[in-house]
Interface confidence: low
């Protein structure tokens, strides 16, 4: 099967845009936007800090580690209330995501 | 205490190919982004390329042909493919922190020495 | 692609003086700025992420601000440990060609 040009396969995403948003302080922020075309029983998630196509299970129940959101060598953490997850570096940089 | 060292550096002649290794101490090569930077004699940092965990790798525009990035599990290597004289210089490798992907957040946190790259005839 | 104009190409202060550098990206780099230091036969070292976020073991002396395209490190109190060259670094990402990252052509610090 041909894929046309812009067309993704199956199960895979691209990165499509960094899109500008303010957050309550007004400071601007950075967002990063995927495209994904994902199949039967999964959702655009992230894994290895890149967008990807995960079990929507993860989704649903927020168990957010389960889809492997960190680099290799970083720790995943679940945010109180499951809102989303922290990916910690071996030198104590944390990353934190909240998913809205 | 994580470090890295660059291995390779030589005087060359011009069209011969080199390849640069990096090999990290301290933490694991394949769990992280790791960049390419060069600087010629008395000039200033030039970014070279990145490579991404899946061995997937980006460029600079004008190193795109020139370098080839690739890694095993214990190097993140730099092919110089056809060497000229104005590719003398040092060229540093360095661990990307943060995500790659989200432009604010890329910066390197650990460079290794450097290695020297003379090209000359 | 993304340019950085860093400025000034070199500078002279004393010991106490605050010290500015700037640099301006050709676009809207999100806060996708890091400033490094880097003394003679050595690598950089990062001194600031993220625009304004202060690395690890780095004196507070060392401050970085700015958002949009245009960027500033402030060395407030200059010390004599500080005279080396100072580089910036922006990152974007697009889909089209993936990460792109790009110095400012660096700033040398000379204190008197």
């Known amino acids: 099967q041909f894929l046309k040009e812009g067309q993704l396969a199956a199960g895979t995403c691209e990165i499509v845009t960094l899109d500008r948003c303010c957050n309550k302080n007004r400071r601007t922020i950075a967002r990063q936007t995927a495209r994904c075309a994902c199949r039967k029983g999964q959702i655009a998630g992230t894994t290895r800090a890149r967008p990807a196509c995960v079990d929507a299970r993860i989704i649903k129940t927020k168990q957010w580690c389960d889809m492997l959101p960190c680099l290799e060598g970083e720790g995943c953490d679940l945010l109180i209330n499951r809102s989303g997850w922290t990916c910690t570096q071996p030198g104590g940089r944390i990353k934190t995501t909240t998913v809205s | 205490q994580e470090q890295l060292v660059e291995s390779g550096g030589r005087l060359v002649t011009p069209g011969t190919p080199l390849t640069l290794s990096c090999t990290a101490s301290?933490?694991?090569?394949?769990?992280?982004?790791m960049s390419w930077v060069r600087q010629a004699p008395g000039k200033g940092l030039e970014w070279i390329g990145i490579?991404?965990?899946?061995?997937s790798t980006d460029y600079a525009s004008w190193a795109k042909g020139r370098f080839t990035i690739s890694k095993t599990s214990t190097t993140v290597d730099l092919k110089i493919t056809t060497p000229t004289t104005e590719d003398t210089a040092t060229y540093f490798c360095?661990?990307?922190?943060?995500?790659?992907?989200?432009?604010?957040?890329?910066?390197?946190?650990?460079w290794g020495p450097g290695t020297l790259v003379t090209v000359s005839l | 692609e993304l340019v950085m104009t860093q400025t000034p190409p070199s500078l002279s202060a004393s010991v106490g003086e605050t010290v500015r550098i700037r640099c301006l990206a050709s676009?809207?780099?999100?806060?996708?700025i890091s400033w490094y230091q880097q003394k003679p036969g050595k690598p950089p070292t990062l001194l600031i992420y993220?625009?304004?976020n202060l690395e690890s073991g780095v004196p507070p002396r060392f401050s970085g601000s700015g958002s949009g395209s245009d960027y500033t490190l402030t060395i407030g109190g200059v010390q004599a440990e500080d005279a080396a060259t100072y580089y910036c670094?922006?990152?974007?990402?697009?889909?089209?060609?993936?990460?792109?990252?790009?110095f400012g052509a660096g700033t040398n610090v000379e204190i008197k």
């Open positions: 360095a661990r990307v922190a943060g995500y790659v992907g989200y432009g604010y957040e890329t910066f390197f946190d650990i």
């Open positions: 301290g933490f694991f090569l394949s769990g992280y982004y």
């Open positions: 490579i991404y965990p899946s061995g």
């Open positions: 676009e809207d780099i999100y806060s996708g």
């Open positions: 993220g625009a304004s």
């Open positions: 670094l922006g990152g974007v990402t697009y889909s089209s060609t993936g990460t792109h990252l790009t």
